[in-house]
Interface confidence: medium
């Protein structure tokens, strides 16, 4: 099925050009999306092209600038946030990235009523996190690992926590491992719906081993970066959840929320917090052995000023075939009765579906079902539930938005997006206004992305928010590669693949093949999305065929495929890439002497193992920032899939699944190993150990390090990286430069 045909006709051929590497590195063909910043049922804010902050009212059709670009520029603001009472705006500047989500910044508060910045009791700098209360204009912020509260922007701050200490105690913000592997946010504090209470997490990293690496900088001596980072089997952070009454913070003080007994009996994690009402909160906990999750609903007890979490309000989710949840345990979406909720978890057939839980998980009512998966619940209103799934036409790499009417019986289901722009749009996400009065649809492809605004009652399209016209025009004279998404059936396993073919692809000719792999648990590479990237260039200009294959361990096709890799990382993911390559060779247009594989991060691990598989299939390959041993990676992620590296658990497979153990097998392939020296995530240690093992085995290989670069290899390093990898592949495939 050809999803994105090239617009090449013979008469036009002389005016068309192939993609260049420069196009990719310059981001010439990048697209825009439009996500409204909703502030009510019918109003949203958007930053205009000239940097004014504009308020749009859908119903009146009016728009006006609430904050001028002049005001933004006066403090070099790169971001903003309007207080819910619309009296103040915070302006964010001096952005300084820390880890994946976290950053520090300077914040200024602008008073919209008098058009001036708030003077007196200004915020300290730099701040680690800042947010408005959901009602009014209270502020909560984290500074030097402690939480502060302001009733009004001009007030002095009220200090809630005092024990915050760099790399030791984190209040209201996650430590490294919780940020990257559990919360996936820069914050760990949550306002109750009306701002009465503020819940926050305290992470104690005192006993966690520290990863230390050099940051070379420009000084005479490098400095050492120290991060408490629990690797597999190491001591983990100790988490506690507190809730403070923001009306009387000094007199009542923070109250700790109790941990369910069945969780507290051994090492555990806190996984998420969801406010239900101002006086009801839902916490999710997870055993360190991540196959048991407990959802605990807690109520405020006025008489004792404490939070009570009765056993009758504990809901257990357990997996007997793998780990709990998908990548993360799903979060509940509560209904209007403030006790029942909707949640995605595996049904009896092993597919993730929406369930409605009223009293117990055992009595859950299944809302969706089929040999496909519900992926996200966007919004529950009085009469509708909006969700996304990959049901339509049985393509796992698509995303469509559905509406289930929950007000009527039996509930009826409608696909909102399936037939809107069927060829162009098969992968959607959505953003809803209050009470789902309106929503925005953002289509990511396979055609050029488009964002549209819709009526929440009728689903009618109101207007196009962004259609990427400039991009469409720019691509008119570009020879884009063809893309097809198909599947292979091998030994009762379905292997979906995406193939990117040169513009003048001729099935009777032979082409070099590059496999791009990620392959991590609960990932998906074969998606119906638009992209003009490095592999597009390799197909368009260099005439390569590129393939992406979703093998065992990947997501959204049921638990059998997902949990196949449980406790066995590095086996089936590699096997399935190899199997797919063999099938591609059988198709007749692959030059089997010119096959390469490359991947980044988990993909670097898989590509390394594939190269060292001893099959003789691959001529060469690249591993960027690979994991080389699961003993070197983060506890939360690794143990989810591998258990513990102890003799009585899974130490044997930890040892068997390293790249180093297969050093000898690299002798007959060309291997390019790449890593950033300041990688906080997959430590440089991983590549250092691969290199050491290869040297000890007297195996020749190529390597590139990027000084002071992290896991993303950003900035100028990106250009250098892709240029370097391009040369390596062209040399491997004997393509002229």
């Amino acid at each position: 099925i050809v999803l994105r045909p090239s617009r090449v006709h013979n008469s036009e051929e002389n005016t068309m050009r192939a993609l260049t590497l420069k196009d990719i590195l310059n981001g010439t063909f990048s697209y825009k999306t439009f996500f409204p910043n909703w502030i009510s049922g019918q109003e949203y804010l958007h930053q205009s092209a000239d940097n004014n902050i504009v308020l749009y009212n859908i119903e009146t059709g009016q728009s006006y600038t609430i904050l001028s670009n002049r005001t933004m520029k006066s403090v070099n603001a790169s971001n903003y946030g309007l207080s819910p009472d619309r009296q103040f705006v915070y302006l964010e500047s001096d952005y300084s990235k820390l880890w994946r989500y976290s950053y520090t910044a300077t914040y200024y508060i602008y008073d919209l009523s008098n058009g001036e910045f708030v003077r007196g009791n200004e915020l300290p700098r730099p701040i680690q996190y800042l947010c408005w209360s959901p009602v009014g204009s209270k502020l909560a912020y984290v500074y030097q690992n402690n939480i502060y509260l302001k009733q009004r922007p001009g007030d002095p701050p009220f200090q809630i926590t005092f024990n915050g200490r760099e790399n030791k105690i984190f209040n209201g913000i996650p430590d490294w491992v919780y940020e990257e592997e559990m919360l996936a946010t820069k914050y760990a504090l949550w306002w109750s719906p009306n701002g009465k209470f503020l819940a926050y997490a305290e992470f104690n990293d005192t006993d966690i081993p520290v990863i230390a690496y050099s940051y070379y900088g420009d000084e005479q001596y490098p400095r050492t970066i120290n991060i408490p980072y629990p690797k597999a089997g190491a001591k983990n952070p100790v988490v506690r959840i507190f809730i403070i009454d923001t009306t009387y913070p000094a007199y009542v003080g923070p109250q700790e929320v109790p941990v369910p007994a069945m969780i507290a009996s051994s090492d555990y994690y806190f996984s998420w917090l969801t406010w239900v009402t101002d006086e009801r909160v839902c916490l999710q906990w997870l055993k360190r052995v991540q196959n048991v999750s407990v959802l605990s609903i807690c109520d405020f007890r006025e008489d004792w000023q404490t939070w009570d979490c009765p056993k009758t309000q504990e809901h257990i989710e357990e997996s007997r075939t793998g780990w709990a949840g998908g990548f993360f345990v799903s979060t509940p979406v509560f209904s209007y009765d403030a006790i029942s909720y909707y949640k995605i978890f595996s049904d009896k057939d092993g597919y993730k579906h929406i369930h409605y839980i009223k009293d117990t998980v055992e009595n859950a009512i299944q809302i969706t079902s089929g040999k496909w998966e519900a992926i996200n619940i966007f919004r529950v209103t009085q009469d509708s539930l909006f969700y996304s799934s990959n049901e339509f036409e049985e393509y796992p790499g698509r995303r469509n938005i559905y509406r289930i009417s929950i007000g009527s019986y039996p509930p009826s289901k409608k696909c909102v997006t399936c037939h809107l722009r069927k060829e162009r749009c098969q992968y959607y996400t959505a953003s809803f206004s209050d009470y789902a009065k309106y929503y925005a649809l953002v289509c990511y492809g396979p055609g050029i992305p488009i964002s549209t605004l819709h009526d929440g009652r009728t689903d009618q399209e109101i207007k196009i928010l962004e259609e990427n016209k400039e991009l469409e025009n720019a691509l008119k004279n570009i020879q884009l590669p063809k893309e097809e998404i198909k599947k292979l059936e091998v030994d009762e396993i379905t292997l979906w693949y995406k193939m990117i073919l040169p513009p003048q692809f001729d099935r009777s000719k032979k082409y070099p093949l590059l496999i791009q792999v990620y392959g991590g648990p609960c990932s998906q590479s074969v998606r119906s999305v638009f992209a003009v990237n490095w592999i597009s260039y390799l197909a368009s200009k260099e005439g390569m065929v590129i393939a992406l294959v979703d093998g065992r361990g990947t997501a959204f096709q049921g638990d059998k495929l997902l949990y196949a890799v449980y406790r066995k990382l590095g086996v089936y993911e590699v096997e399935d890439q190899i199997t797919a390559v063999r099938k591609f060779i059988e198709m007749g247009f692959i030059d089997e002497k010119r096959i390469a594989i490359w991947g980044w991060s988990y993909g670097g691990y898989v590509s390394s193992l594939a190269l060292a598989s001893g099959t003789g299939l691959f001529k060469c390959g690249i591993a960027v920032a690979p994991v080389s041993s699961w003993e070197y990676y983060a506890s939360v992620y690794t143990e989810r899939f591998m258990g513990l590296p102890t003799k009585d658990d899974n130490l044997e497979h930890y040892k068997n699944s390293t790249v180093m153990a297969r050093a000898e097998y690299f002798r007959n392939v060309d291997y390019l190993l790449i890593h950033g020296t300041a990688d906080d995530n997959v430590h440089f240690q991983n590549s250092a150990q691969i290199a050491k093992a290869l040297v000890n085995a007297q195996v020749d290989f190529q390597a590139m390090w990027y000084s002071d670069q992290n896991h993303g290899l950003s900035g100028l390093s990106t250009n250098h990286l892709y240029t370097h990898m391009t040369h390596f592949l062209k040399q491997c495939f004997s393509l002229s430069d």
Epitope: D155, P156, Q159, Y248, A250, Y251, V252, G253
Partner: antibody
Framework: QVQLLESGGGVVQPGRSLRLSCAAS????????MHWVRQAPGKGLEWVAF????????SYADSVRGRFTISRDNSKNTLYLQMNSLRAEDTAVYYC????????????WGQGTLVTVSA | DIVMTQSPSSVSASVGDRVTITCRAS??????LAWYQQKPGKAPKLLIY???SLQSGVPSRFSGSGSGTDFTLTISSLQPEDFATYYC?????????FGPGTKVDIK
């Protein structure tokens, strides 16, 4: 204007009980948290107890916790302090004070009522 | 509990003098400090809250400053009615605690 008037003080034997009252006027009593603060003869000020505007939250100093109970009747604009198991060290002038609001200071004070605990 | 200390414990001054009283907290309290004036036989009266904000009705000769652990109350020009005992109070963490007081008397 804001007025706070304490009553109920007097001489009491150790181990006995006493109930103090504070009548409020000149402001919307139900909107403010209230406190009791005491001052032993010739000594400094010591905070005793707090109650939220709606009566749902209260807090006590360690020295009185379990013996004293703060309460209020918003319909009567009155604050109370029930003092049980009184000790000699509880001898002091007891002031009721209106909370400053979010700032947790004491914006207005009553004139005080003397409690003497003596055998 | 946060311990508050004041210095000096007493000060003798004349009308028109500038008087400065300092207050120190045993741990950081941000700006959550109040100052009170108490005359013999009377109830305390709030002068300054949030370290530097003047309570309404209080003469502008009274001012407060400081944050963290060190705070100051300044009377720019002492008046006859200002002879009294002054207390600081922290309001940042439970329980609220007072300093021991500073007595300002006539020289």
């Amino acid at each position: 204007q804001v007025q706070l008037l304490e009553s109920g003080g007097g001489v009491v034997q150790p181990g006995r009980s006493l109930r103090l009252s504070c009548a409020a006027s000149g402001f919307t009593f139900s909107s403010y948290a209230m406190h009791w603060v005491r001052q032993a003869p010739g000594k400094g000020l010591e905070w005793v107890a707090f109650i939220s505007h709606d009566g749902n939250r209260n807090s006590y100093a360690d020295s009185v916790r379990g013996r004293f109970t703060i309460s209020r009747d918003n319909s009567k604009n009155t604050l109370y302090l029930q003092m049980n198991s009184l000790r000699a060290e509880d001898t002091a002038v007891y002031y009721c004070a209106r909370d400053l609001g979010y700032y947790n200071g004491f914006s207005y004070w009553g004139q005080g009522t003397l409690v003497t605990v003596s055998a | 509990d946060i311990v508050m200390t004041q210095s000096p414990s007493s000060v003798s001054a004349s009308v028109g003098d500038r008087v400065t009283i300092t207050c120190r907290a045993s741990q950081g309290i941000s700006s959550w400090l109040a100052w009170y004036q108490q005359k013999p036989g009377k109830a305390p009266k709030l002068l300054i809250y949030a370290a530097s904000s003047l309570q309404s009705g209080v003469p502008s000769r009274f001012s407060g400053s400081g944050s963290g652990t060190d705070f100051t109350l300044t009377i720019s020009s002492l008046q006859p009615e200002d002879f009294a005992t002054y207390y600081c109070q922290q309001a940042n963490s439970f329980p609220p605690t007072f300093g021991p007081g500073t007595k300002v008397d006539i020289k």
